[in-house]
């Protein structure tokens, strides 16, 4: 296992329907055939997958039917989507990066983007 | 190194707007937000609200709500805040200051004074 | 919105003596996202702690922070001449980010 840089924006404000995109970008040493990205969570401590995609150079990045999240790739970088936020799911989404194939297998893990999530206020009550 | 650089003090009449400028340098900007804080004469600190400056997205305080815009331009990293229909109790040091999340650098201030 | 309490509202001791600041938040947020700021008179507040215990670039070993869910404290061991000055504690884990009302650390 060969260690690999991952860069991400540190901060950043999610927009009021609860959708948040950042560019995670890998310096890839090599020509990547497959490569797989993982969004982690780390919320006091505590590391979850948000969610995972392979996908091959050239190739749209296919997450499961009910992921969350959404991607696209350009050469080395993987616009990241993640909607349907809440504010109770602000905290630290850590970006993974694994080139799968050929060998040798690279892993890169960046240092995270803190994502912030507000909840719309309620809307007045009206008598229409 | 990383350093805010704001614009100089300003005075102003009830009523009117004033917008303060931010100058970022020694960083990549659009990697973190831009908050800003004031200080009243002998009070403590108010935030105001943050902007994400790799998006635009912005978070005001419900008190500014509708009377604040804070703005930037990447192509000049520096970020903008505009406060309008200023009253005398607005007068206060307004700081800039990058959200790493934490405030971990700030500018010197700037001070803004409402008088007739 | 995490409203922040800080305590006491004056501490006056003498250099060399340790000080003690207490910060209670209204409710429970992530313990990661607490600072705390130091503001001299006429100068921009500097960030002294962040994640509630790690120190900020620069900041002498003698500032140290503890605590998590509710209750904060920032410890100075012995107090300098140039540790005189306002102290405010920060959360930065929600939005709206919110400061304590701070704690005046002067010379008895």
């Known amino acids: 296992c060969k260690a690999m840089h991952v860069a991400q924006p540190a901060v950043v404000l999610a927009s009021s329907r609860g959708i948040a995109s950042f560019v995670c970008e890998y310096a890839s040493p090599g020509k990547a055939t497959e490569v797989r990205v993982t969004v982690l969570r780390q919320a006091d401590s505590q590391v979850t997958e948000v969610c995972a995609a392979t996908y091959m150079m050239g190739n749209e990045l296919t997450f499961l039917d009910d992921s969350i999240c959404t991607g696209t790739s350009s050469g080395n970088q993987v616009n990241l989507t993640i909607q349907g936020l809440r504010a109770m799911d602000t905290g630290l989404y850590i970006c993974k990066v694994e080139l799968m194939y050929p060998p040798p297998y690279y892993l890169g893990i960046g240092n995270g983007t803190q994502i912030y999530v507000i909840d719309p206020e309620p809307c007045p009550d009206s008598d229409f | 190194q990383v350093q805010l650089v704001q614009s100089g003090a300003e005075v102003k009449k009830p009523g009117a707007s004033v917008k303060v400028s931010c100058k970022a340098s020694g960083y990549t900007f659009t990697s973190y937000g831009i908050t800003w804080v004031r200080q009243a004469p002998g009070q403590g600190l108010e935030w105001m609200g943050w902007?994400?400056?790799?998006?635009?997205?912005?978070h005001y305080a419900q008190k500014f709500q509708g009377r604040v815009t804070m703005t930037t331009d990447t192509s000049t990293t520096t970020a903008y805040m505009e406060l309008r229909s200023l009253r005398s109790d607005d007068t206060a040091v307004y700081y800039c200051?990058?959200?790493?999340?934490?405030?971990?650098?700030w500018g010197q201030g700037a001070l803004v004074t409402v008088s007739s | 919105e995490i409203v922040l309490t800080q305590s006491p509202g004056t501490l006056s001791l003498s250099p060399g003596e340790r000080a003690t600041l207490s910060c209670r938040a209204s409710?429970?947020?992530?313990?990661?996202?607490l600072a705390w700021y130091q503001q001299k008179p006429g100068q921009a507040p500097r960030l002294l702690i962040y994640?509630?215990?790690s120190r900020a670039t620069g900041i002498p070993d003698r500032f140290s922070g503890s605590g998590s869910g509710t209750d904060f404290t920032l410890t100075i061991s012995r107090l300098e001449p140039e540790d005189f000055a306002v102290y405010y504690c920060q959360q930065y884990g929600s939005s709206p980010f919110t400061f304590g009302p701070g704690t005046k650390v002067d010379i008895k």
């Open positions: 902007i994400s400056a790799y998006n635009g997205n912005t």
């Open positions: 409710q429970s947020g992530s313990s990661s996202y």
């Open positions: 200051a990058r959200v790493g999340p934490s405030f971990d650098y």
């Open positions: 994640g509630a215990s």
